[in-house]
Each structure stands twice: as C-alpha cells, then as structure tokens.
Amino acid sequence: YKLVCYYTSWSQYREGDGSCFPDALDRFLCTHIIYSFANISNDHIDTWEWNDVTLYGMLNTLKNRNPNLKTLLSVGGWNFGSQRFSKIASNTQSRRTFIKSVPPFLRTHGFDGLDLAWLYPGRRDKQHFTTLIKEMKAEFIKEAQPGKKQLLLSAALSAGKVTIDSSYDIAKISQHLDFISIMTYDFHGAWRGTTGHHSPLFRGQEDASPDRFSNTDYAVGYMLRLGAPASKLVMGIPTFGRSFTLASSETGVGAPISGPGIPGRFTKEAGTLAYYEICDFLRGATVHRILGQQVPYATKGNQWVGYDDQESVKSKVQYLKDRQLAGAMVWALDLDDFQGSFCGQDLRFPLTNAIKDALAAT
C-alpha cells in the first residue's frame, strides 16, 4: 500500500516546538512525501518560500538512506488562487510553457514527480484540468525516453460531491494520473452553525441531504462509481481536527455553536488544531466516540473538537483495504506529533505510524 504524506513548507515558521523542517521527517515512515507548495511565476514552476531550495535538499537527502522513498512537489494550494491556475490551464501557450518547465525543475531539485493541487477548478475549468493532466503526463513520458525513470503525476482532489461534479472528469483524469489523493476531510465547518465531525468515515444517523454526501465512505464510493480505479485512489486521513466554540450547554454532535474554536498555540488558526495541539487539549477534556461515524470528538469548557486518533485511523485503513484502494494519504506530517513530545507515547508521528502499522497488518 502507498502511504502518501504531505509536508508543508510554512510549518517552519511555527513557534517553538511547532516548527518543522524536512530533516525532522522519518525517512522510513511514508512511501511518498509530497512537499507543499510550489508556485507558478510567468507560466514557469517556481519556488514559493525564500529557502525552498534548501528545504528541497533537506527533504530529498532522506532518500539517501531509503532509496525506496519517493518525493513529489505539489504545485498550487489555497494561496495560489484558482483563477491563476485557470488562466494557465486554459491558454494553450501558457499551459505548454508551464508543462515544459516542470521536468527540468523536478530533476534539478531531486523530486520524483509532481502533485497538482488546483484548489479547485471551477465549472469553466473542467475540460482544461483534464487537458493539463493529459498533456503533463505526455510530457513526462516523452521526457523519460532517454532511459530516465519516468516522473510521477498525482493530483489532490476535493471529496465534496458538488465540487467533484463541477470540477473533475474523473474517468478521463484517472487514465493519466499515477495516483489520486482524495481529500476526505473538511466535510463540516462552522458555517453550518452546529458541531459536527469534519472527517467521518460513514454517514451519521441524523444526516439528511446534502449531509448524506459529507463522509469518507460516500466520497470514495462516488469516485469509484465515476471511474476512478481503486488501484489509483489514495484516501485522505487528517492529522488535524476542526474545532468549534459551543453556544449553549449542549455538547453533542449537532450542538449549536457561535463560531470556530479558539486558535491553537502553534498553528494559530481559529477552528483548526494540529494533532499535537489536540493531545494537549485532551488533558482534562471529555472524549466521545461517534459510533456510526467511527471518529472521536472531545469537549472542554466551551470548546469542541472533532479529530482522528489511533483508533479511528485504524478503522479508516481497514475500510480502504476492504475497498482495495491504493493506500492512505496524510495531511500533514507537520501536524502530527512529529517530535513525539506532546502525546505522551515517546513515539514520533503517532498517527502516521498507526496508519503505517495498519496498512502493513495482514
């Protein structure tokens, strides 16, 4: 099985024990590590951070001791802007320039492939996204002709049904991608006005339309029905939780909220907590399991957080094995307890290790 793990370059800027550099990663933990994110400047793939080249080197030296490790560079991301991607993909010349720029950049910096993180194509972009993938793959095939190992091509896709329908021609893009990472998280947000888990495995008992689509099982099944081969589908598992501020004494699933949860000490983003921050939160918190959805949540005071733990990730891995998927994807290594100092197990990357162990178990 593949274990595809994202590392985010901006995690270097977190304070103190939250700061993560690629040399802190475990070279034997994942089969693939994806560095997020690269930029596109003047239609050419480019660095984003001032020290990206140094960090690329740090990451790719992990392969010295584990030659089976594959590294990919992810281009795009939330801050890149969907329209910027759209304009490159929709213009024949811009698209060609971008595609041509990718192989030399990846080779120069020691990457084994490219991950497309167009978040997200709109209605106008569905065909262009397919064309971009098809032409990128053709370029990778052509570039490998002189006996080089062919560069890998993957894409991170939304797990939301509406976005899948409007943005992706799943059957066509699946033909050209080596694997597809489906982002089976962020199903529930503060805008709903109630608590709810952001990455449930199954549909909740109370879920009505459109909530019935907002779970991992539905998203994976839908992708398969649309023509994604199970052998290319990699299922996303988050090492972060989504938090809410409760608006009343109710604390269960569906309880009213006043907004997102308070920011974490290190990640500093309202409504989001890294797993290592959740381990801190759990001291003195009350933990519940949403039985049907097979995921936990915890409450403390007026704070509510839905997250994944070692038990829930094992359930998710068993599920992906039952569906004969290609493996698991983790967002992100730097949100796991990468130092092993927060979660009291003397184990670095406890969640990702639990996924790895479950994938290896017979």
Epitope: G81, S82, Q83, R84, S86, K87, S90, L119, Y120, P121, G122, R123, R124, D125, V162, T163, S166, G189, W191, R192, P210
Partner: antibody
Framework: QVQLVESGGGVVQPGRSLRLSCAAS????????MHWVRQAPGKGLEWVAV????????YYADSVKGRFTISRDNSKNTLYLQMNSLRAEDTAVYYC????????????????WGQGTLVTVSS | NFMLTQPHSVSESPGKTVIISCTRS????????VQWYQLRPGSAPTTVIS?????PSGVPDRFSGSIDSSSNSASLTISGLRTEDEADYYC?????????FGGGTRLTVLG
Amino acid sequence: QVQLVESGGGVVQPGRSLRLSCAASGFTFSSYAMHWVRQAPGKGLEWVAVISYDGSNKYYADSVKGRFTISRDNSKNTLYLQMNSLRAEDTAVYYCARDTELQLWSGGYFDYWGQGTLVTVSS
Amino acid sequence: NFMLTQPHSVSESPGKTVIISCTRSSGSIAHNYVQWYQLRPGSAPTTVISDDDQRPSGVPDRFSGSIDSSSNSASLTISGLRTEDEADYYCQSFDDSNWVFGGGTRLTVLG
C-alpha cells in the same frame, strides 16, 4: 429563461433596517453562487456581497461588513440581503446577480442580473 | 484591495473603433480574469466580455477584450461603432474573495 426579480426596496431612515429579496426562476437556483451589487445615484457599480450555492461561504465588501447579511433559501429559490444600521451612503439601486460558478474560490462572473430595487436612506 | 481605473468618458463617431482601458492598481492583471459589463439607463447590466476575451452568446463580434501584462491593464475594443453602443461600460475582476468593479466609462457615440 433566467429571471431575477428584486423587491423590498423603499425609503428608510438612517440607522434602521431593511430586507431585500430576489426571486429567481428559469434555472436551478441551488447550483449557483449569488451576489448583490449596488449603484448609488450618479456613481458606478459596487459589489456588495456573495453567497455560495449552499450558503456555506459568504463574503462582503468592507463598506457593509458587520451591517449587511446575505442569505438564501434554496427551497424557495430566493436570495436575501438583510441591511441593518443603514446610512445615507447606502442609498442605491440594489441588483441581484447570478454567478457562473457554484463556489466562491473560482471567482466566476455575473452572467444574469435583475432590474434592481431602489433603496433610499434619508431622514 | 486593488482598484481598477477606467477613463471617465470616451466618445467616437459611428463606424469608428473605440478602446476603453482598465488598469489594475496592485497585483497582476494576468492572475485573474477580467469581465466587461454594459449598463444602459433603465436596463439591467449585461456581460459583453467574460474571462478576458470571451464573448458570451448574443454579443456581436464587434466587441473584443484583451489584457496587457506590461501595462497591467485590460482593454475593451468596440469596432464599427453603432448608436446603440452608447452606454456605461464597467470592467470587473476578482481577487481573494473580492469582486471589484472599475469606476465605469461613459461611451458617447457622436452624431
């Protein structure tokens, strides 16, 4: 054919509230993001607010943030703009407009507009 | 937030060509699509150009759009001017959850 019909405009005193409605027909309302755009007398167009197809995301112009609330009822094919703490500078024709996209991240454009409803804020 | 600056007014004779410019104050004009809307008195606005240079169905091919990265601006060109083209024209673009309009250009068709 696509039709957008605004209503709820009128004369209102500063500091008071007003709710505009936009009745949509001729298309699947729940498959499109929707906007409010206004034009003050003798001035240009100004974008006011947007809401995604399912109401999950909403954005506002700085000039109305904290005072105006955009919402939608997909079962009634209707878009709303709740305007509180109205000011003289909010006097304008308010247009409801359909976005070409469902979500807000891809920044669609306004492909259909209503005829507008006039809001006058005056004491 | 960025701004889009248009000339206040332009005028030209029937049959001639007119170009209306739209300059972006910050951020690249090439990073986001530009639209152009026509607004006639008493009518709802209509789109004459979308996605920089695309004409929606029903818009005559006398209307064309382009962008120029070197001047960080977009242009609407109307050739073979007709009296019915007299209207206000607005450019519009998007960035980071803001939909921004230019100040508008009044096109007067002389004669």
